[in-house]
């Protein structure tokens, strides 16, 4: 057993450009407090777990009001250390999260408002009993300077707080098989203290607080003789009285896992899978409650009013994990339909829709022609999220409002002359050509390449385009 101690030295603007605005103002005075969360190990999956080594909340710092026009200085800090007690061995490698919180003290509806100013995280190796380790971490434009250490609570000593020391009973030497306790040479390493109540005849331990059974005995305290009436789980030597194989003491016999933990055998011992809210070798340590603030990113802590009840984090949109510690890339689910652009704003998801589509997820296909009138007898044609007008003869433009010059495109072939006409255009063809656009040559023998011209029109007459 022992205590992890964290000393915050300063929290303020980091070096370099872009100094942050002061978090407090004359209108909105505030004060800081800190939260630390510890997890065992260096592995990435530690992020999924709750603060299994423990968590602590600092006191509130002094009230701070920004001086108008002044840059944000180092902010006034709470007094004292943040202390995280641990019951089991110190793991040697650990992950930490340190959060700096602001408490606004203005007139708030529904009490004070809290907001997270900065969060730093890291993974470190640390031996218990060593000196203070200093650290500097940056979060955005803020900088946090702090020191930390792990120390054992007597009588535990050692880099993992697993060795126990007692004052020497004799002035000169320790008992048989027991070494002096470095660095406390006047103390001796104590024999291991097994779990309270562990049978001295049938139990033993290799770790403090353990109770392992000798063959033929079982139960959490090794006080229950193994039944010889059943031969279903042969594990031990043959019993002379029954001819059965007496089940030897399997590591999970009597389920050493407390608080509803489930036991699984490992090659060397056993492993407990603990329910939420419990941890430790045998799930014997509880105490992560909602008061410890285990839910990150604004998650609501549901349940967990006392150490015996589990908590569940109800996460805000965009976060998941048992402690809301994982940001979800919600755009990877491609929620925007019809080619919309997805924007994850953190607190909300936005879809920027292509022309012709609308709705929170661009799910509505707009009727491009709805409410769009094409003037002068034009008709609206839908297409690709935009509308266009197919204009009646003599009109053009986006809405057919412009009067078209039918001769602008030089529609009369072979040198024919174009005349604008109220119903369109008329081509006056050059000699030797005919047709609405003067596109057909007249044959030298007087026959045309077309059927005979309509009655009343001779070749060479202006041909009106209808």
């Amino acid at each position: 057993a022992g205590v992890f101690e964290l000393q915050i030295h300063s929290f303020g603007p980091g070096p370099g450009p872009g100094a942050p605005r002061s978090p407090c103002s004359a209108r909105l005075p505030c004060r800081l407090f800190f939260r630390v969360c510890l997890k065992p190990g260096l592995s990435e999956e530690a992020a999924e777990s709750p603060c299994a080594l423990g968590a602590a909340l600092s006191a509130r710092g002094p009230v701070y009001t920004e001086q108008p026009g002044a840059p944000a200085p180092d902010l006034p800090l709470p007094d004292g250390l943040l202390q995280v007690p641990f019951r089991d061995a110190w793991p040697g490698t650990f992950s930490f999260i340190i959060e700096t919180w602001r408490e606004e003290l203005g007139d708030q509806i529904g009490g004070p408002a809290w907001s997270l100013l900065a969060r730093v995280a890291g993974r470190r190796r640390l031996a218990a009993g060593g000196p203070w380790a200093r650290d500097i971490q940056r979060a955005g434009a803020w900088e946090l300077r702090f020191s930390y250490r792990a120390r054992c609570e007597p009588p535990a000593v050692g880099t993992a707080c697993t060795r126990l020391c007692r004052p020497r009973s004799a002035p000169s030497r320790c008992g048989p098989g027991l070494r002096p306790c470095a660095p406390l040479e006047d103390e001796c390493e104590a024999p291991l203290v097994c779990r309270a109540g562990c049978s001295p005849e049938h139990g033993f331990c290799e770790q403090p607080g353990e109770c392992r059974c000798l063959e033929g005995w079982t139960g959490p305290l090794c006080t229950v003789p193994v039944s010889t009436s059943s031969c279903l789980s042969p594990r031990g030597p043959s019993s002379a009285t029954t001819g059965c194989l007496v089940p030897g003491p399997g590591p999970c016999d009597g389920n050493p896992c407390a608080n509803g933990g489930s036991c699984s055998e490992t090659p060397r011992s056993f492993e407990c899978t603990c329910p939420r809210g419990f941890y430790g070798l045998r799930c014997e340590v509880s105490g992560v409650t909602c008061a410890d603030g285990p839910c990150f990113n604004g998650g609501l802590c549901v349940g967990g009013a006392d150490p015996d009840s589990a908590y569940i984090c109800h996460c805000p949109p965009g976060f998941q994990g048992s402690n809301c510690e994982k940001r979800v890339d919600r755009c990877s689910l491609q929620p925007c339909r019809n080619g919309g652009l997805c924007l994850d704003l953190g607190h909300a998801l936005r879809c920027r829709c292509r022309a012709g589509f609308a709705g929170p997820r661009c799910e509505h296909d707009l009727d491009d022609c709805a409410g769009r009138a094409c003037a002068n007898g034009g008709t609206c044609v839908e297409g690709g999220g935009a509308h266009r007008c197919s204009c009646a003869l003599g009109f053009g433009g986006r809405d057919c409002r412009e009067r078209a010059d039918p001769c602008a495109a030089r529609p009369c072939a072979h040198g024919g002359r174009c005349y604008a006409h109220f119903s369109g255009l008329v081509c006056a063809c050059a000699p030797g050509y005919m047709g609405a656009r003067c596109e057909f040559p007249v044959h030298p023998d007087g026959a045309s390449a077309l059927p005979a011209a309509p009655p009343g029109l001779r070749p060479g007459d202006p041909q009106r385009y209808l």
């Epitope: 990113n297 604004g298 976060f319 940001r327 607190h347």
Partner: nanobody, 120 residues
Framework: EVQLVESGGGEVQPGGSLRLSCAAS????????MGWYRQAPGKQREWVAV???????TVAPSVKGRFTISRDNAKNTVYLQMSSLRAEDTAVYYC??????????????EGQGTLVTVKP
């Protein structure tokens, strides 16, 4: 400003049922959770059930299977259906709303509370 008005509390025998309602008025930010927390005399306050604006629900393990939460977004109302009530469910039940503005900024609102008493 958000106002929350609870109703439906009262006295009930063990094994009985009650339905609490909470109506929110005022302007509620669209990204939020509405729910119920309770406080028994001398105990920590405890969120019992929460439902987000996107429909996700969370119920405390201690009441799972007995309490259900539902929400009518159109009416900005949240309901807590409590059945198989036990003596340990006796508490003042408060309606609460958490508005999330970002991952580091949110605000809580709470109602006046309604007393639920479970006794034989």
């Amino acid at each position: 400003e958000v106002q929350l008005v609870e109703s439906g509390g009262g006295e009930v025998q063990p094994g009985g049922s009650l339905r609490l309602s909470c109506a929110a008025s005022g302007s509620i930010f669209s990204i939020n959770a509405m729910g119920w927390y309770r406080q028994a005399p001398g105990k920590q306050r405890e969120w019992v059930a929460v439902v987000s604006s996107d429909g996700r629900t969370t119920v405390a393990p201690s009441v799972k299977g007995r309490f259900t939460i539902s929400r009518d977004n159109a009416k900005n109302t949240v309901y807590l259906q409590m059945s198989s009530l036990r003596a340990e469910d006796t508490a003042v039940y408060y309606c609460g709303v958490r508005e999330w503005y970002s991952d580091s900024d949110w605000r809580d609102y709470e109602g006046q509370g309604t007393l639920v008493t479970v006794k034989p």
